[in-house]
């Protein structure tokens, strides 16, 4: 999916008002220095591509993020503010959600959500030069 035509300001508002808090809740008890940010993005569409991938694509050691509150809110934000997203992505993410029965917070998941926090922060500062 091409995130170029999304309403970035609305997505940013949703992140600031609620998604960011859910990410912090998920990471509670974890030191902010515990994980190094290894995933980066260069502009807002690229950031959303990476956010979508890390949030909804199962990875080795972490297959349960799609059921988390921040993931549900991310999906809702992309569905309403990215034209055509629902038709191309929702069924795929629904299938992943159904495939996972239990919510298990592994260290790998914590690392992945830490990466997500970094991607979202980068999404909110699109004019910063890439480090």
């Amino acid at each position: 999916y091409d995130f170029t035509n999304c309403d970035f300001e609305k997505i940013k508002a949703a992140y600031l008002s609620t998604i960011s808090k859910d990410l912090i809740t998920y990471m509670s008890g974890t030191k902010s220095t515990e994980f190094n940010n290894t995933v980066s993005c260069s502009n807002r569409p690229h950031c959303l591509t990476e956010i979508q991938s890390l949030t909804f694509n199962p990875t080795a050691g972490c297959a349960s993020l799609a059921k988390e509150m921040f993931a549900m809110k991310t999906k809702a934000a992309l569905a309403i503010w990215c034209p055509g997203y629902s038709e191309t992505q929702i069924n795929a993410t629904q299938a992943m959600k159904k495939a996972r029965k239990s919510k298990v917070t592994t260290n790998k998941c914590l690392e992945q959500v830490s990466q997500l926090q970094g991607l979202w922060r980068r999404f909110n500062r699109p004019l910063l030069k890439q480090q």
Epitope: C6, A14, S17, K73, A76, A79, I80, W81, C82
Partner: antibody, heavy 120, light 111 residues
Amino acid sequence: QVQLVQSGAEVKKPGSSVKVSCKASGFTFGSYGISWVRQAPGQGLEWLGVIIPLLGVPNYAEKFQGRVTITADTSTSTAYMELSSLRSEDTAVYYCARGAEYFYWYFDLWGQGTLVTVSS
Amino acid sequence: QSALTQPPSASGSPGQSVTISCTGSNSDIGGYNRVSWYQQHPGKAPKLMIYEISKRPSGVPDRFSGSKSGNTASLTVSGLQAEDEADYYCSSYAGTDTFVLFGGGTKLTVL
């Protein structure tokens, strides 16, 4: 029972505000879109705006920007639409409508409607 | 952005078919497969009849069908019945700003 129940009819003076409520039951309120649509007497349907309670960030039709405020309270599964600076042309039946989960632009469940009459 | 364009009225005899058109632009009907149709009887709330151009919600008779060509969407009611007499509204997604546009409505009369 899956339904949207709206507050009762209102009579308002020009220049004042009206706040209409829409209580949801029988479904998970947060992840659906709640849109507000109005219908003036003998006229067609007109979309005012939408909110996804889970996110709390509303989208408004350009025509009503600055005059309409849509909010949602997930603890009571209730959405609200407030319209300010009322004029006689705002006399209409106001409907809340549920936008399907993640497909917010078609409305598969409607409230019974609230008649708002603006008259001096 | 103005409303989608529908004919104000349409009619047919019981058992016949009638088609209602809905014309928009590239930025609404033509740009997305997000057209829906609503039926409204006098004094009642609208009811979803067709969504995503041609899908029917459960409980809607298969006499109701939808299609799209370019910037124009159509609703066809076949085997007309007396209870089909109502106002019909088309609707289309129109981007993240305008979001939803409605047609002006078509009054369907069963003769």
